[in-house]
Amino acid sequence: SETTTGTSSNSSQSTSNSGLAPNPTNATTK
């Protein structure tokens, strides 16, 4: 198996959950 390391994408030291809806629902079919 392989191991890889990712470095910080952004300079803050906390992960921001702000890009995702807090209580998401499934997309509706139109």
Epitope: Q13, T15, L20, P22, P24, N26, K30
Partner: antibody, heavy 115, light 112 residues
Framework: EVKFEESGGGLVQPGGSIKLSCAAS????????MDWVRQSPEKGLEWVAE??????????YYAESVKGRFTISRDDSKSRVYLQMNNLRTEDTGIYYC??????WGQGTSVTVSS | DIVMTQTPLSLSVTIGQPASISCKSS???????????LNWLQQRPGQSPKRLIY???KLDPGIPDRFSGSGSETDFTLKISRVEAEDLGIYYC?????????FGGGTKLEIK
């Protein structure tokens, strides 16, 4: 420094299983919503699964294509998130990224499903 | 699933000149809390993606202010006011309003 270190990728036969692991450091892991996203030339970036934090009761979400085959889990005491992948198909081939709610990303680990 | 359509597929820009990328979603991304969960990611050659912008226009920490995002509902735009050499790569829009989260097909930015 924030680091996401993924491991567990490799070559597996169709129908086989593999478990990916992602170790986070330098970030308050317990409050992070953790996702696995895969990338392939055929499908581009494709979200796979997500597990939320304790305040969200560790709720999990899955892409339809992996439901019933993949299981996401986490161990906050070890700052790790896992992806158990069973009954693998050739279309599961790709680079699998561990990401904190699309904010921080690891460098990816390659999974190849082939006979 | 929400379909995210990006245009153009690729663009070639001279250093110092502006660049603009469009992203259209198949449904409105406005969430019930009034926020719109539209993200922009950058993937440089040989690297993993990194988020530049979340909630349409909010810059992530450490992202240069030459990047900006705008739009609402189904139409969104990423703008680079003055392209630099380090900006080359592929840019993706991604929606986090509805499950499953979905990504655009990407726009490749090349430097002239």
């Amino acid at each position: 420094e924030v680091k996401f270190e993924e491991s567990g990728g490799g070559l597996v036969q169709p129908g086989g299983s593999i478990k990916l692991s992602c170790a986070a450091s330098g970030v308050p892991f317990s409050g992070a919503w953790m996702d696995w996203v895969r990338q392939s030339p055929e499908k581009g970036l494709e979200w796979v699964a997500e597990i939320r934090d304790k305040t969200k009761n560790y709720v999990t979400y899955y892409a339809e294509s992996v439901k019933g085959r993949f299981t996401i889990s986490r161990d906050d005491s070890k700052s790790r998130v896992y992806l158990q992948m069973n009954n693998l198909r050739t279309e599961d081939t790709g680079i699998y990224y561990c990401t904190g709610a699309m904010d921080y990303w690891g460098q990816g680990t390659s999974v190849t499903v082939s006979s | 699933d929400i379909v995210m359509t990006q245009t153009p597929l690729s663009l070639s820009v001279t250093i110092g000149q502006p660049a603009s990328i469009s992203c259209k979603s198949s449904q409105s991304l406005l969430y019930s809390n009034g926020k719109t969960y539209l993200n922009w990611l950058q993937q440089r050659p040989g690297q993993s993606p990194k988020r530049l912008i979340y909630q349409v226009s909010k810059l992530d920490p450490g992202i240069p202010d030459r990047f900006s995002g705008s739009g609402s509902e189904t139409d969104f735009t990423l703008k680079i006011s003055r392209v630099e050499a380090e900006d080359l790569g592929i840019y993706y829009c991604m929606q986090g309003t509805y499950l499953p989260w979905t990504f655009g097909g990407g726009t490749k930015l090349e430097i002239k």
